[in-house]
C-alpha cells in the first residue's frame, strides 16, 4: 500500500454506496472501484506524476523553505466514468452508462 | 493566512528564481507571484472549491473511515502564465510572453 513515505500513485479504494448514503438513489452497483491517489510528491518529481510547472516550482521552494511552503499534492489528474443504475424523478430505474468523474484514471502531483 | 484549519483557498507565494536555481536561465523578473493553494477540503465541500464527483465521494468515505481514507486535497485547478526574459541558445535575451502554468489562477478540492 502507498503510505506517506511512498511516491504518489494510484491505490485501490472500494466504495460502498451504502457507506456514503448514496444507496438511496443508486440501485446498482452496490460498490465500485473509485481508487485513491496516495503518496508524497517528493523532489525530484518524476515524469509519471506529470507535474505542472507550478508543482515543480512549489517543490523546489518547499525544498528550500520546508516550514513555509507545502509540498505539491498527489491528486487525481484524470477521472473515468462508471455505469450506474439509478431511480429518476419518477422512480423509474434508469441506466446511466457514463456517470463521469467517479473513478481515478491517473494520479499526479499538483 | 490559510492554515490547516481554514478552508481551501489561494494564498500568496512570492517565488525568487535565485532561491530555486532558475536564475541561471531566467533573467527577469527576479521573482514572481506563484500563489499557493492552502487549507483543508472539509465536509461539505463548497461550490467554490469546484469538487469533482470523486472528491465528493472521497470526502464522504473519509468522514466514515477517517483513518483509512484521506481527505481530498487543495490544489491548483487552473493555472496562469507569466512573462519571462530568458537567454536562447545563442545567448540572445528573448521574451516569452506566455510561460504557461506558472501561477495559480484557481484552487479547488481534488
Amino acid at each position: 500500500s502507498a503510505g506517506a513515505g511512498s511516491h504518489c500513485q494510484k491505490t485501490s479504494l472500494r466504495v460502498n454506496f451504502e457507506d456514503i448514503g448514496w444507496d438511496s438513489w443508486i440501485i446498482a452497483p452496490k460498490e465500485y472501484e473509485a481508487y485513491e491517489c496516495k503518496g508524497g510528491c517528493f523532489f525530484p518529481l518524476a515524469d509519471d506524476v506529470t507535474p505542472t510547472k507550478h508543482a515543480i516550482v512549489q517543490t523546489l521552494v518547499h525544498l528550500k523553505f520546508p516550514t513555509k511552503v507545502g509540498k505539491a499534492c498527489c491528486v487525481p489528474t484524470k477521472l473515468s466514468p462508471i455505469s450506474v443504475l439509478y431511480k429518476d424523478d419518477m422512480g423509474v430505474p434508469t441506466l446511466k452508462y457514463h456517470y463521469e468523474g467517479m473513478s481515478v484514471a491517473e494520479c499526479g502531483c499538483r | 493566512s490559510a492554515g490547516a484549519g481554514s478552508h481551501c483557498q489561494k494564498t500568496s507565494l512570492r517565488v525568487n528564481f535565485e532561491d530555486i536555481g532558475w536564475d541561471s536561465w531566467i533573467i527577469a523578473p527576479k521573482e514572481y507571484e506563484a500563489y499557493e493553494c492552502k487549507g483543508g477540503c472539509f465536509f461539505p465541500l463548497a461550490d467554490d472549491v469546484t469538487p469533482t464527483k470523486h472528491a465528493i465521494v472521497q470526502t464522504l468515505v473519509h468522514l466514515k473511515f477517517p483513518t483509512k481514507v484521506g481527505k481530498a486535497c487543495c490544489v491548483p485547478t487552473k493555472l496562469s502564465p507569466i512573462s519571462v526574459l530568458y537567454k536562447d541558445d545563442m545567448g540572445v535575451p528573448t521574451l516569452k510572453y506566455h510561460y504557461e502554468g506558472m501561477s495559480v489562477a484557481e484552487c479547488g478540492c481534488r
Epitope: - | 521573482e31 512573462s83 540572445v92
Partner: antibody
C-alpha cells in the same frame, strides 16, 4: 561567427528608389526578428522597422517616418533580409544597419551601408 | 511613442574615474516585472554593440566595469573606472512598445 553583411548603398535622387539586402550567417536566421536601423550623418540611431518570424506570419512594423514608403521582407531559405525604399527624401540619407535579434533586443549588427539621397 | 532622453549629451571623464549616464523614458518601460531597457555602445566607425539589457544585465563579453541600474522611467549606465577604449557614444533603448526608440546618445570622452 555571427555575420550580417549589407549590400552596397550609394547615391540616389530624391523621389527615387533603392533596395538594400543583408546576408546573414553564423546563426539560425529564421529564428530571429530582423530589423533595419539607420543613422543620419553625425546623428543618433533611429529604428526603421522590423520583420518578425514565419510563426508571426512575417508581420512587419515601421517607424512613422518611413511607413508607406519602405518595405521590409525576408527570405529564410537564403538567410537574407531586404529593405525596399521608395519615394526617397533627402532626410533618408543615413547609414543603414541590418540588425538581428529577439522580440526584446538588437543582438547582432552589420557594419552598415551609406545611402545618400541628393540631386 | 515612448521618448527616451539621455543626460548629459556629452561627458568628459579622467581615466580611471567613474562615468555616469542617465536615461529617462517618457513613460514606464517596465512590464511583467521586467525592464524593457537596453544600452548600446557605439565606437567611432563601428556599428552599435549591446552593452546592458533588461536594465542591469551585462551583454556577452562586456567588462565588469560596465553596470546598469534603474526601473520604471529612470535608468543609469555606470562605468566604474574609465578606460581609453571606452570612448564611444552610448545609447539607451526601449523595447516595451513599437516603435522601439533610442535616446539621442551621450558622447563619452577622456578628460
Amino acid at each position: 561567427e555571427v555575420q550580417l553583411v549589407e549590400s552596397r548603398g550609394g547615391l540616389v535622387q530624391p523621389g527615387g528608389s533603392m533596395r538594400l539586402s543583408c546576408a546573414a550567417s553564423g546563426f539560425t536566421f529564421s529564428n530571429y526578428w530582423m530589423n533595419w536601423v539607420r543613422q543620419a550623418p553625425g546623428k543618433g540611431l533611429e529604428w526603421v522597422g522590423h520583420i518578425r518570424l514565419k510563426s508571426d506570419n512575417y508581420a512587419t512594423h515601421y517607424a512613422e517616418s518611413v511607413r508607406g514608403r519602405f518595405t521590409i521582407s525576408r527570405d529564410d531559405s537564403k538567410s537574407s533580409l531586404y529593405l525596399q525604399m521608395n519615394s526617397l527624401k533627402t532626410e533618408d540619407t543615413a547609414v543603414y544597419y541590418c540588425a538581428g535579434g529577439s522580440n526584446y533586443v538588437f543582438a547582432f549588427w552589420g557594419q552598415g551601408t551609406l545611402v545618400t539621397v541628393s540631386s | 511613442d515612448i521618448v527616451m532622453t539621455q543626460s548629459p549629451d556629452s561627458l568628459a571623464v579622467s581615466l580611471g574615474e567613474r562615468a555616469t549616464i542617465n536615461c529617462r523614458a517618457s513613460e514606464s518601460v517596465d512590464n511583467y516585472g521586467i525592464s524593457f531597457m537596453n544600452w548600446y555602445q557605439q565606437k567611432p566607425g563601428q556599428p552599435p554593440k549591446l552593452l546592458i539589457y533588461a536594465a542591469s544585465n551585462q551583454g556577452s563579453g562586456v567588462p565588469d566595469r560596465f553596470s546598469g541600474s534603474g526601473s520604471g522611467t529612470d535608468f543609469t549606465l555606470t562605468i566604474s573606472s574609465l578606460q581609453a577604449e571606452d570612448v564611444a557614444v552610448y545609447y539607451c533603448q526601449q523595447s516595451k512598445e513599437v516603435p522601439w526608440t533610442f535616446g539621442q546618445g551621450t558622447k563619452l570622452e577622456i578628460k
